[in-house]
Interface confidence: medium
């Protein structure tokens, strides 16, 4: 009976012996499992965030480009309705152009001598900028970044003048200092005559052949509405 | 659809002055400057002038200024070029042509008239 | 005034074959130009417009290429109706000028 017991014993001491080194290895391979969906979890983790960052970054991308989008389809739904109709009124500025209180502005890339920027405006029924105020010489600034850039105002004919009539004397100014001196020095014939904004913004004189970027403007009609979107 | 239809065959004595019609249709007249072109016979083209019908405002080229008058009449989409001390060397075809609109890019003919010949004989 | 210089001022080509002809500027025009076509007795036809877009309704064997003083017009493979005359046109301020003009013939 002894050895019987002694039989069963190490039976049970064999058995609990594989279950001990079965379970042994299920921990094991779970523990290692367990890494893996640690790992797995992780790197689902920082995938999410990112496709969270994607999404937002499209999403402003988006609202840029909705209003863009609301934007030119209110400027080309007024240019149709212009076009529909027979009036000779201005009612929105064209397309490539920037509207400004009540007026549009178009910004040249390429430099031109004074008198042919001037000719280039006026075949777009549209004038070189007149600036009449400080916060029209702010927006023009803004747009043209430190460029010498042609303005509609020169002396050519003796006293400074804006090309679209506006009054010199009792307007905005906006000069550097010691500007305008009609200087000589420069050797390229004669004195300054034309009026550019400098890299600063303020105003300077200068020989009129120089080939600087310019800015067209031309206002809105007045009694003009803005369209209803369609 | 865009038109431009011109005025017939003139005959012209030297000296004398002659005035082309171009009527516009199928777009809004204002919205657009018209120009003149013309071609004597076997010759190449040549630019003569523009007129903004909006604004009235007018370029013409160096060598017909003070001779060439362009007009336009908005209330009956009409656009006129007149050319005045009539030289027979002002034998040619006269066209009108509708500058395209694209502001701030590059402009363009679109558009032309059928052309007026005009003839300065004695 | 700006100069415009138009080359060839004649060529004879066949059906099929593959056409250049050269507009050159005497300063900068960026891409300020226009080609046309013009049949005997007819006004002239918009072909090309700034330079390289094709106007409306005109075949897509014309291209146009260049910017600044050097634009070229290529007829990739010539058909019947192109035998005409062409010319290019700067609209870089007034006056707005034409090229001399190229007179393509049947060879």
């Known amino acids: 009976q002894n050895s019987q017991l002694q039989e069963e014993l190490r039976g049970l001491r064999e058995t609990f012996s594989n279950f001990t080194a079965s379970t042994e290895a299920q921990v094991k391979g779970l523990s290692t499992q367990g890494g893996n969906v640690g790992r797995k979890m992780k790197s689902l983790e920082s995938q999410l965030e990112k496709q969270q960052k994607d999404l937002s970054e499209d999403h402003s991308s988006l609202l840029l480009h909705v209003k863009q989008f609301v934007s030119d389809l209110r400027s080309l739904s007024c240019q149709m309705a212009a076009l529909q109709g027979n009036g000779s009124e201005r009612t929105c500025c064209p397309v490539n152009w920037v509207e400004h209180e009540r007026s549009c502005y178009w910004f040249s890339r390429s430099g031109k001598a004074w008198a042919d920027a001037d000719n280039y405006c006026r075949l777009e029924d549209a004038h070189l900028v007149v600036v009449t105020s400080w916060e029209e010489q702010k927006f023009v600034q803004h747009h043209i970044g430190p460029v010498n850039t042609w303005m509609g105002l020169h002396d050519q004919n003796g006293p400074w003048k804006w090309v679209d009539g506006t009054d010199y004397e009792t307007g905005f100014k906006n000069w550097r200092p010691e500007q305008p001196d009609d200087w000589y020095g420069h050797g390229l014939g004669g004195g300054e005559d034309c009026a550019h904004f400098t890299d600063d913004g303020r105003w300077n004189d200068d020989v009129c052949q120089r080939p600087y970027r310019w800015v067209c403007e031309t206002e809105l009609d007045k009694a003009s509405q803005e369209p209803p979107l369609l | 659809e865009v038109q431009l239809v011109q005025s017939g065959a003139e005959v012209k004595k030297p000296g004398s002055s002659v005035k082309v019609s171009c009527k516009a249709s199928?777009?809004?007249?204002?919205?657009?400057?018209i120009n003149w072109v013309r071609q004597a016979p076997g010759q190449g083209l040549e630019w003569m002038g523009e007129i903004f019908p909006r604004s009235d405002q007018t370029f013409y080229a160096q060598k017909f200024q003070g001779r060439v008058t362009i007009t336009a009449d908005k209330s009956t989409s009409t656009a006129y070029m007149e050319l005045s001390s009539l030289r027979s060397e002002d034998t040619a075809v006269y066209y009108c042509a509708r500058k395209g609109r694209e502001y701030g890019t590059s402009h363009y003919f679109d558009y032309w008239g059928q052309g007026t010949t005009v003839t300065v004989s004695s | 005034d700006i100069q415009m210089t138009q080359s060839p001022s004649s060529l004879s080509a066949s059906v099929g074959d593959r056409v250049t002809i050269t507009c050159r500027i005497s300063?900068?025009?960026?891409?300020?130009l226009a080609w046309y076509q013009q049949k005997p007795g007819k006004a002239p036809k918009l072909l090309i417009y700034a330079a390289i877009n094709l106007a409306e309704g005109v075949p897509s064997r014309f291209s146009g290429s260049g910017s600044g003083t050097d634009f070229t017009l290529t007829i990739s493979s010539l058909q019947p109706e192109d035998f005409a005359t062409y010319y290019c046109?700067?609209?870089?301020?007034?006056?707005?000028?034409f090229g001399q003009g190229t007179k393509l013939e049947i060879k």
């Open positions: 046109q700067h609209f870089w301020g007034t006056p707005f000028t």
């Open positions: 300063e900068n025009i960026y891409s300020n």
């Open positions: 199928g777009y809004t007249f204002t919205a657009y400057g």
